[in-house]
């Protein structure tokens, strides 16, 4: 048993049929010695008396908020949550495996630049009785500070018969140098509680590996005289690290016909303009990627050829 | 990625082309190592990230873009130990910090060159003959060093009398390639920045 927050405790249980469970001794936080009674979850049924209460925790019915009283006055509370271990593996019932980029990916994170700011998100099919807390650091043995906000519900989607809820959190490394070469990874830890079930999830990464620039901005077409060619121009996204001559991007320009089956013409360039042939009903799209470190491409920025 | 390779203009900052070749070569070598040594801990997640130049050079600090010198987090350990001149510096661009920066890059390359050559000698003794260093990568390191043209003491190649542990050597190769790729990215950024200045 360990303390998660003030008056909130996690009982770690090996979860299998007829498991013996864990013996837990609760102590009433009071100088009083006599006339103390214990109840569970606003029930009037007295579970025991005395300054300590010994319970055998085997299932969720044994978890909850234990309260000690004296003469109608509440003295203290202890909330017991359960953390299940099945076949030596901690349960992952609360969050959905996103399976990207690999199996058992519960947390996904992205950064728009090298400023030390990043966003993580996760999915669940649970709609209520749910709470999260996010902590993060650079390295684990001698951790350096990363500050995370509160996790918020950021999207709801219908997937077949199920509703899926996306939560996200923003974090910022306390003293980040955009030019630094990372040798210690960022660690992200998410505590999750659903009803009386506790679970924790972790992710470890370098900012350089989760970079995904915003799409290029101000995408414009300029027709070239007496030609089917157009000059496409764009700019670096505002959110990208500066100076741009140091944090350079490379670009992919694509001409795509109306039909998905039509052949796509692609050009790669380090410049912020390109000359392409604009077909009728086609659209021109441009996306960006760090020029020197191949992390993710941005989403496409698009304009119609007409 | 199969990107069209731009050929540098004659008037271009001379080291940019070499640094682009360096990054390409080390990235290819790392990819080859990850594929060949697939049953060894050779991915970014599996290895310990060590920097053989730590406390010996200060490339990131010495080569910091002017715009980032206002960022206190970037100024933790700014060194000022190298004062030399090199042929990558067009005379009008010569400045103390730039010389310091390019000298630091040269020292990095020299250190990695020695490590890679020592390691390659060991790998050539491996009866499995599983992996060797790409001669192209070693040549590209050499070319960039020559373009930087700093007069520096030659570091003797390390020789070891004991029987090499090939497993450890291959893991060390992965660690070294990951670190060198990160440094090659920094070098490429620096050259691009200097070229635009």
């Amino acid at each position: 048993i360990w303390e998660l927050k003030k008056d909130v405790y996690v009982v770690e249980l090996d979860w299998y049929p007829d498991a013996p469970g864990e013996m837990v001794v609760l102590t009433c936080d009071t100088p009083e010695e006599d006339g103390i009674t214990w109840t569970l979850d606003q029930s009037s049924e007295v579970l025991g008396s005395g300054k300590t209460l010994t319970i055998q925790v085997k299932e969720f019915g044994d978890a909850g908020q234990y309260t000690c009283h004296k003469g109608g006055e509440v003295l203290s509370h202890s909330l017991l949550l359960l953390h299940k271990k099945e076949d030596g593996i901690w349960s992952t019932d609360i969050l959905k495996d996103q399976k990207e980029p690999k199996n058992k990916t519960f947390l996904r994170c992205e950064a728009k630049n090298y400023s030390g700011r990043f966003t993580c998100w996760w999915l669940t099919t649970i709609s209520t009785d749910l709470t999260f807390s996010v902590k993060s650091s650079r390295g684990s043995s001698d951790p350096q500070g990363v500050t995370c906000g509160a996790a918020t519900l950021s999207a709801e989607r219908v997937r077949g018969d199920n509703k899926e809820y996306e939560y996200s959190v923003e974090c910022q490394e306390d003293s980040a140098c955009p030019a630094a070469e990372e040798s210690l990874p960022i660690e992200v830890m998410v505590d999750a509680v659903h009803k009386l079930k506790y679970e924790n999830y972790t992710s470890s990464f370098f900012i350089r590996d989760i970079i995904k620039p915003d799409p290029p901005k101000n995408l414009q077409l300029k027709p070239l005289k007496n030609s089917r060619q157009v000059e496409v121009s764009w700019e670096y996204p505002d959110t990208w690290s500066t100076p741009h001559s140091y944090f350079s991007l490379t670009f992919c320009v694509q001409v795509q016909g109306k039909s998905k089956r039509e052949k796509k013409d692609r050009v790669f360039t380090d410049k912020t303009s390109a000359t392409v042939i604009c077909r009728k009903n086609a659209s021109i799209s441009v996306r960006a990627q760090d020029r020197y470190y191949s992390s993710s491409w941005s989403e496409w920025a698009s304009v119609p050829c007409s | 990625r199969n990107l069209p390779v731009a050929t540098p203009d004659p008037g271009m900052f001379p080291c940019l082309h070499h640094s682009q070749n360096l990054l390409r070569a080390v990235s290819n070598m790392l990819q080859k190592a990850r594929q060949t040594l697939e049953f060894y801990p050779c991915t970014s997640e599996e290895i310990d990230h060590e920097d053989i130049t730590k406390d010996k050079t200060s490339t990131v600090e010495a080569c910091l873009p002017l715009e980032l010198t206002k960022n206190e987090s970037c100024l933790n350990s700014r060194e000022t130990s190298f004062i030399t001149n090199g042929s990558c510096l067009a005379s009008r661009k010569t400045s103390f910090m730039m010389a310091l920066c390019l000298s630091s890059i040269y020292e990095d390359l020299k250190m990695y060159q020695v490590e890679f050559k020592t390691m390659n000698a060991k790998l050539l003794m491996d009866p499995k003959r599983q992996i060797f260093l790409d001669q192209n990568m070693l040549a590209v390191i050499d070319e960039l060093m020559q373009a930087l043209n700093f007069n520096s003491e030659t570091v003797p190649q390390k020789s070891s009398l004991e029987e090499p542990d090939f497993y450890k050597t291959k893991i060390k190769l992965c660690i070294l390639l990951h670190a060198f790729r990160i440094r090659a990215v920094t070098i490429d950024r620096v050259m691009s920045y200097l070229n635009a200045s």
């Epitope: 909130v8 909850g64 009785d129 709470t131 807390s133 | -």
Partner: nanobody
Framework: EVQLVESGGGLVQPGGSLRLSCVAS????????WGWYRQAPGLERELVAS???????NYQDSVKGRFTISRDSAKNTVYLQMNSLKPEDTAVYYC??????????????WGQGTQVTVSS
């Protein structure tokens, strides 16, 4: 901050029925238990019924078989269905919610109360 708003109270004849509702809003997090309490003039506040995440509903002896606590988690609402009402059920009824918000810790929230009067 979690807010609770009760509704559904009023004047009813003995033997009649009322359904009280309590809606929670704000950062509710994980609900530990809901409770309905009442306070008659000159008496202490007493627990009427509770519903916990880990177990079965619990009722004070005097209301067993007449009152039913239920909840609609999707609407963050708890109900108290009161049948066969008696004059001694006259009181102000309060809704209570105990929950856990990991960023804040445990909380214990109360509504402002709704008056129930049983009289002919």
């Amino acid at each position: 901050e979690v807010q609770l708003v009760e509704s559904g109270g009023g004047l009813v004849q003995p033997g009649g029925s009322l359904r009280l509702s309590c809606v929670a809003s704000g950062s509710i997090g994980s609900v530990v238990s809901w409770g309905w309490y009442r306070q008659a003039p000159g008496l202490e506040r007493e627990l009427v019924a509770s519903d916990a995440s880990g177990g079965r509903p619990n009722y004070q002896d005097s209301v067993k078989g007449r009152f039913t606590i239920s909840r609609d988690s999707a609407k963050n609402t708890v109900y108290l269905q009161m049948n066969s009402l008696k004059p001694e059920d006259t009181a102000v009824y309060y809704c209570n919610l105990r929950g856990l918000q990991l960023d804040m810790g445990l909380y214990d929230s109360w509504g402002q109360g709704t008056q129930v009067t049983v009289s002919s």
